[in-house]
Every structure is written in C-alpha cells, then in structure tokens.
C-alpha cells in the first residue's frame, strides 16, 4: 500500500482543516488508514482522524482544530496499521480556504435598484472577518449567456445594482463566494444560490 498523491490540506481558519490524498489503488480509507495530527508545541496531544473515501483511491480527512492562529503548525502522520506511509507538516494560515458566505438575500423593494446582502461567515474576533472580499455571480435561468460576475472589493457584504442592467420579466439567480488577499487564500465554495424575478418599469422614451 502506497501513497500516490501526498496529502494536501486547506483550513477554514477557524475550526476545520480538510486533507485529501490518493492511494495507489482502491482503498477502504476508514478501515485501513489513520491520519494523526498534532500541534507543534510542548505537551500537545496527538489527534486521530478517520478518513472517508473520496472516489476509489481517494481519501479525505476533516481535522478538527481549536481557534486557528497564524503561528499554528501541525505534524501529520499517515498510518496503515503499524506502517507509516507518509509524514509531513501543515501550517493552516498558509493554506486557507474561507468558509462560504451565507444568508444571501435579494431585496427588490428599492425602486429600480437591486440590493444583494449576505452574511460574513466569520465571527468578529476572527482575523478573516475584516479581510474578506467577495465575488457575486448573477445569471439568468433562461439564457446561459446572461452570466456575470461582480467583484465586491469593499468589506461590506452587500452589492447594489440597477435592476435595468438585467433583463426585465425573467428570473435570475445569484450566489456569492469569498477570499482574503492578506492570506492569499483560495476562493471559498459558492454560497447556496437565491432566485428572484427581475421586473422594473421601463422609462418612457421621449421623442
């Protein structure tokens, strides 16, 4: 039994890090493998993660972590019974994938303006709380070509757009994701999408 692709891990910079790897053949990850992880400091405990299957030869492990700080560094040991298959380390602050934003809402009651709001996925004391920027994806359910991305580079989790920039009388969907430049993070997963019917009054044409 050998590791084909070494574990790569990402942290939500709060409570979970997710590690994925591939074995050299079909593996029952939960019965055959264990990933041990330990915070590097005196008297820290070793924790055991039971991996789950992620495709035939793929395994995934969710490592529970206490409130991450930038100095945290973990040793990782992948075991198959008594055999050490791989040894490595992981610094969560260097491999961050933020949590997805939540509660995306489209407010259509402001005249001819769409207000999209969502929630920051971190509590105020978390370092990422004040460092997230967002991308909002809006698309038409009727026309696959009507697909647009708005970059929200300010901290407020909201976006205003003129309803007239979208077609009237049809349904749209929106979703949002986050990243933090300060930690050079990857993008978060997209939030669940929300749907609304876009309608606005066309201005009278003056001749």
């Amino acid at each position: 039994m050998k590791v084909l692709q070494e574990p790569t891990c990402v942290s939500d910079y709060m409570s979970i890090s997710t590690c994925e790897w591939k074995m050299n053949g079909p593996t029952n990850c939960s019965t055959e493998l264990r990933l041990l992880y330990q915070l590097v400091f005196l008297l820290s405990e070793a924790h055991t993660c039971i991996p789950e299957n992620n495709g035939g030869a793929g395994c995934v492990c969710h490592l529970l972590m206490d409130d991450v700080v930038s100095a945290d560094n973990y040793t990782l040991d992948l075991w198959a019974g008594q055999q050490l298959l791989w040894k490595g380390s992981f610094k969560p602050s260097r491999h961050v994938k933020p949590r997805a934003p939540g509660n995306l809402t489209v407010h259509t009651n402001v005249s001819d303006t769409l207000l999209l709001t969502w929630s920051n996925p971190y509590p105020p004391d978390n370092y990422l709380y004040n460092h997230l920027t967002y991308a909002v994806n809006i698309w038409s359910e009727n026309d696959p070509a009507d697909f647009r991305i708005y970059n929200v580079t300010y901290l407020e989790p909201s976006l205003r757009i003129a309803a007239s920039t979208l077609k009237s009388g049809i349904s749209y969907r929106a979703r949002v994701r986050a990243w933090a430049q300060c930690y050079n993070t990857t993008w978060s997963e997209w939030s669940p999408s929300t749907k609304w019917h876009n309608s606005y009054r066309e201005p009278f044409e003056q001749h």
């Epitope: 979970i16 405990e45 409130d67 509660n103 996925p121 939030s191």
Partner: antibody
Framework: QVQLVESGGGLVQPGGSLRLSCVAS????????MNWVRQAPGKGLEWVSY????????YYADSVKGRFTISRDNAKNSLYLQMNSLRDEDTAVYYC????????WGQGTLVTVSS | DIQMTQSPSAMSASVGDRVTITCRAS??????LAWFQQKPGKVPTRLIY???SLQSGVPSRFSGSGSGTEFTLTISSLQPEDFATYYC?????????FGQGTKVEIK
C-alpha cells in the same frame, strides 16, 4: 489524561449570584478555547458560553446575555462562569467543555435556583 | 440564530434494528454539524463531527451524512449499549445550538 472538574454549584434564590469554576488538567489549558454547556433536569443540552484561546473573545447564548460572564485564568488552569440575576429557568447541571467542538466534558455541577 | 430541529423526539427500536435520526437546520450550516450521545446520568460524548466524520474510538455502526440544512445520524445495527439520547449540534455560527434530542428506547 484530560480532566475537567467543575465546582461552585448550589442552591440560590432568584435574583441571586453564583460563580462556577472549572479546573483543567492533563493538557495545556492556555492553548484551548473553552465552553459552558448546561442541561436542565430532564431536558436537553443548551450551549451557554464560549471563550477563545486565541483572542479571548467571548460569546453567549441569548438566554444568558447580560447576566452571565465567562472568564479564564490561564495561570490557574481555570475557567469561570459568573452568573448574576439568576432565574428559575437557570436551574441546570452546568458542564465545562473543551474545544474543538466539545471533545472533553467535565462531570458537571448542579445549580438550583429556587425560593 | 440558527434553529436545529431533530426528529423523532423519541423512538422505540430493537437490538439489530437500523436506526435513523434526522436533524434540520433553519439555514445553511455547510458541514459544521456534530452528533453526541448521552446515556442517563452520564456526560455527552461526541460520535460524529463535520457531518460525516467518525470520532476516533466510536464504533463504525455509527455514521453521519448530509450537508447544508439536512443531516442524518444512522446506527446500522442497534446494540444494547446504544440505547441513549442523541443530540445534533451546529457550530457554524454563534450562538451554537443543539437539537432538542432524540431518545432511543428499547421496544
């Protein structure tokens, strides 16, 4: 091995105050965020409060906000819950529980609020 | 605040039965969900975290699934020691919230 021992429970009148303590051993307390969780007699679990190891930030359940205060003394390996303006509905066994996500619990201390 | 609704609140089952308990969140919590078991007079113990990750030392007859708002705890073959109360917990955001519990009793 990890051990959490709560104390300070007892009988108190409505409107009174009580201070619960939780002494930790078997791990580096200063590196762990901590929680208080309670359970009223014959009822379910209710999260009460959290204190972060990293920032010292605190969070509370709406039912205790403004009345309870969580704190810690890393030098004494101790977690505290100061409970003021106690009500009948605060009667419960109070557990301290360690992060991440309540991996270890104490045995609990019973708080009875009654006149 | 996020509400967690567990069902059923109580159930009777026999040794060897397959038992399923569900937990519904009032809003999306991704996979930030854990399951706990509590026996009478005892302290709760964590069975599952991150919706589907089995806690080390917990028998493999316990499994968890789900993401977003719908979650399930399954006991594939109920054993005598599994008669207890089970709670789900969301830790996606503060305040953290538990489900109201599901008591699994002997039929």
């Amino acid at each position: 091995q990890v051990q959490l021992v709560e104390s300070g429970g007892g009988l108190v009148q409505p409107g009174g105050s009580l201070r619960l303590s939780c002494v930790a051993s078997g791990f580096t307390f200063s590196h762990s965020s901590m929680n208080w969780v309670r359970q009223a007699p014959g009822k379910g679990l209710e999260w009460v409060s959290y204190i972060s190891r990293a920032t010292g930030a605190v969070y509370y359940a709406d039912s205790v906000k403004g009345r309870f205060t969580i704190s810690r003394d890393n030098a004494k390996n101790s977690l505290y819950l100061q409970m003021n303006s106690l009500r009948d509905e605060d009667t419960a066994v109070y557990y301290c529980a360690r992060e991440p996500v309540f991996d270890y619990w104490g045995q609990g201390t019973l708080v009875t609020v009654s006149s | 605040d996020i509400q967690m609704t567990q069902s059923p609140s109580a159930m009777s089952a026999s040794v060897g039965d397959r038992v399923t308990i569900t937990c519904r969140a009032s809003q999306d919590i991704s996979n930030y969900l854990a399951w706990f078991q509590q026996k009478p007079g005892k302290v709760p113990t964590r069975l599952i975290y991150a919706a589907s990750s089995l806690q080390s030392g917990v028998p493999s007859r316990f499994s968890g699934s789900g993401s977003g708002t719908e979650f399930t705890l399954t006991i594939s073959s109920l054993q005598p020691e599994d008669f207890a109360t089970y709670y789900c917990l969301q830790w996606s955001s503060y305040p953290r919230t538990f489900g109201q519990g599901t008591k699994v009793e002997i039929k």
